[in-house]
Interface confidence: low
Amino acid sequence: SEVEYIAEVGQNAYLPCSYTPAPPGNLVPVCWGKGACPVFDCSNVVLRTDNRDVNDRTSGRYWLKGDFHKGDVSLTIENVTLADSGVYCCRIQIPGIMNDEKHNVKLVVIKPAKVTPAPTLQRDLTSAFPRMLTTGEHGPAETQTPGSLPDVNLTQIFTLTNELRDSGATIRTA
């Protein structure tokens, strides 16, 4: 099943995807699409790169903010809405018909947390979604399992995430 990433409405979502150009600087085309990776290419393409640069974006909200030329093709979706929820496909289009690298990730967009959730709700959420809180472009700062989660609520989690990364609240679940 897809790895899930959670973002609040109005924030920026960060969907990681990368490859290692070898030798450095020899890039391959990449497409991001809404929907699971199909047999060929990407369905409902939201962003596409060629060997040199981003050459197709369906909206100004879609960005590659990482070091694209080093293979960081992580997708940032700015100012997400509930409609952005769903599975996204990152397809690294390596020549040769069996060589594409396909990565399906799931974006879950939630409404802003207005109040502190009840403890029972918090426990339900944390047991359903063991979380890795991502703090930057290069992966998790710490890994937390349901048994080791500190006593913080969703509002605090999102506040902490926003402070740690300006690309928005994104929580990765195993």
Epitope: P21, A22, V28, F40, N51, P95, M98
Partner: antibody, heavy 117, light 113 residues
Framework: EVQLLEAGGGPVQPGGSLRLSCAAA????????MSWVRQAPGKGLEWVSS????????YHADSVQGRFTISRDNSKSTLYLQMNSLRAEDTAVYYC??????????WGQGTLVTVSS | DIVMTQSPDSLAVSLGERATINCKSS????????????LAWYQQKPGQPPKLLIY???TRESGVPDRFSGSGSGTDFTLTISSLQAEDVAVYYC?????????FGGGTKVEIK
């Protein structure tokens, strides 16, 4: 020497089914992607399906998607093509081909499939 | 899909003369990382399966006579038979194996004038 021997072709009525097989020898079958390519009488070549070395990834042409299924048994060094809901336009010589994953293919002699009522 | 366009459809050449077949792809089949063009040439004689002549656009398959050569890069490719022999009468196909779906040119029939 690479050897690919197709079998299972023959006449079939529209809507019917056939299962083609391709026995491979002369190379380590499990290391290579395999494909099926067909050629209608007097026509050019059309790729049909491909499957990765371990069978984990299978691709099919749009024209056969949902009707044909490629599979393989690495323990028997054999490639298969299950063809269902056959149509007149599926009439062709079907060739088994080695690789296409990262290099060009080597082809068997082919087996003729004739779809006719 | 990458469309492969061959020209001419047929070609009549005198024995011992040069035959040239062109193939154009709708997008580049050059992979800069490997500096290789994912293009092959096949020869098909009546009643026989296609036989690989050239791969990586210019690498001659083992056992193929050196009168056959391939050239080109990116989107434009050429198969040349430097001195046509009687046994070269056949249909020749180009094929890209850069991306799925695999696609072939329509074929060029080579005959003796």
């Amino acid at each position: 020497e690479v050897q690919l021997l197709e079998a299972g072709g023959g006449p079939v009525q529209p809507g019917g089914s056939l299962r083609l097989s391709c026995a491979a020898a002369g190379f380590t079958f499990s290391n290579y992607a395999m494909s099926w390519v067909r050629q209608a009488p007097g026509k050019g070549l059309e790729w049909v399906s491909s499957i990765s070395d371990n069978g984990g990834t299978a691709y099919h042409a749009d024209s056969v998607q949902g009707r044909f299924t490629i599979s393989r048994d690495n323990s028997k060094s054999t490639l298969y093509l299950q063809m269902n809901s056959l149509r007149a336009e599926d009439t062709a010589v079907y060739y088994c081909a080695k690789d296409f994953g990262d290099s060009p293919g080597y082809w068997g002699q082919g087996t003729l499939v004739t779809v006719s009522s | 899909d990458i469309v492969m366009t061959q020209s001419p459809d047929s070609l009549a050449v005198s024995l011992g003369e040069r035959a040239t077949i062109n193939c154009k792809s709708s997008q580049s089949v050059l992979y800069s990382f490997k500096n290789k063009n994912y293009l092959a040439w096949y020869q098909q004689k009546p009643g026989q399966p296609p036989k690989l002549l050239i791969y990586w656009a210019s690498t001659r398959e083992s056992g193929v006579p050196d009168r056959f050569s391939g050239s080109g890069s990116g989107t434009d490719f050429t198969l040349t038979i430097s001195s046509l022999q009687a046994e070269d009468v056949a249909v020749y196909y180009c094929q890209q194996y850069y991306s799925s779906p695999l696609t072939f040119g329509g074929g060029t029939k080579v005959e003796i004038k």
